[in-house]
């Protein structure tokens, strides 16, 4: 069937980067500037994506592939193929309808994007709080209170990455 189709349809011979030009007896014509065709046999070329404003060009458009965008510094990509750029906040904040707001007490965000998440509830695992949480960091859970009774083997916890309560510079 494929061979039959290619014999009947001259457009199937047009490679990527060209289109089958109906106005010129179905000759394979190169894609015009700022357009591309990523597969063979196309009857039109697609318009290249333009990276405007907060979007910057990560990969230029070619005759066979679309441009790719990412976000300028201070923004990060959202959605498939970076279809949106969202403003960063600081660690310890989340982006709301009214802008970047500090995480409420009992929640934290250790990234410049995303939402504030509740601190881990150590007691649910029968553990105690070893290091208090901050707006930027989750609590660190330690051994259960029973494990800390006299005579129990001591556990040396790993040192925290930085002093709790101090924001990153």
């Amino acid at each position: 069937f494929e061979r039959t189709r290619s014999l009947q349809d001259p457009c199937s011979n047009c490679p990527a980067g060209t289109f089958c030009d109906n106005n010129r007896n179905q000759i394979c014509s190169p894609c015009p500037p700022n357009s591309f065709s990523s597969a063979g046999g196309q009857r039109t070329c697609d318009i290249c994506r333009q990276c405007k404003g907060v979007f910057r060009t990560r990969k230029e458009c070619s005759s066979t592939s679309n441009a790719e965008c990412d976000c300028t510094p201070g923004f990060h990509c959202l959605g498939a193929g970076c279809s949106m750029c969202e403003q960063d906040c600081k660690q310890g904040q989340e982006l709301t309808k009214k802008g970047c707001k500090d995480c409420c007490f009992g929640t934290f965000n250790d990234q410049k994007r995303g939402i504030c998440r509740p601190w881990t509830n150590c007691s649910l695992d029968g553990k105690s709080v070893l290091v208090n949480g901050t707006k930027e960091r989750d609590v660190v859970c330690g051994p259960s209170p029973a494990d800390l009774s006299p005579g129990a083997s001591s556990v040396t916890p790993p040192a925290p990455a930085r002093e709790p309560g101090h924001s990153p510079q």
Epitope: G53, V54, Q87, K97, G99
Partner: nanobody, 122 residues
């Protein structure tokens, strides 16, 4: 095609005022949310302000109570009244459509003007 043309930028002393305008064409302005962004020298973009088609307004913290966004649908125009200007407001200001309706978020289908320079210096 869609066109956004900003005007009204210039050199102003600290504490002074400027009114930026954005003339829109090529789309249904009255039903479109619009926004202002800025890019300071050597820095990234910053979302400044947005206005819904219905008139609800939003501002980034640093310009609240100093800047006022408004629109005139009859004239297909967007405005940014900037009062009590500070040196840190120095930037190129851009008018953009705001299809996401989300603070600090633009989509690839949004359109942008070429920008107008605002310099605040004594």
């Amino acid at each position: 095609q869609v066109q956004l043309v900003e005007s009204g930028g210039g050199l102003v002393k600290p504490g002074g005022s400027l009114r930026l305008s954005c003339a829109a064409s090529g789309f249904t302005f009255s039903s479109s949310a619009m926004s202002w962004a800025r890019q300071a020298p050597g820095k990234g973009f910053e979302w400044v302000s947005g206005i819904y088609s219905g008139g609800s307004t939003y501002y980034t913290e640093s310009v609240k109570d100093r800047f006022t966004i408004s629109r005139d649908n009859a004239k297909n125009s967007l405005y940014l009244q900037m009062n009590s200007l500070r040196p840190e407001d120095t930037a190129v200001y851009y008018c953009a459509t705001w299809g996401t309706l989300r603070f600090g978020v633009w989509a690839e289908y949004d359109h942008w003007g070429q920008g107008t320079q605002v310099t605040v210096s004594s």
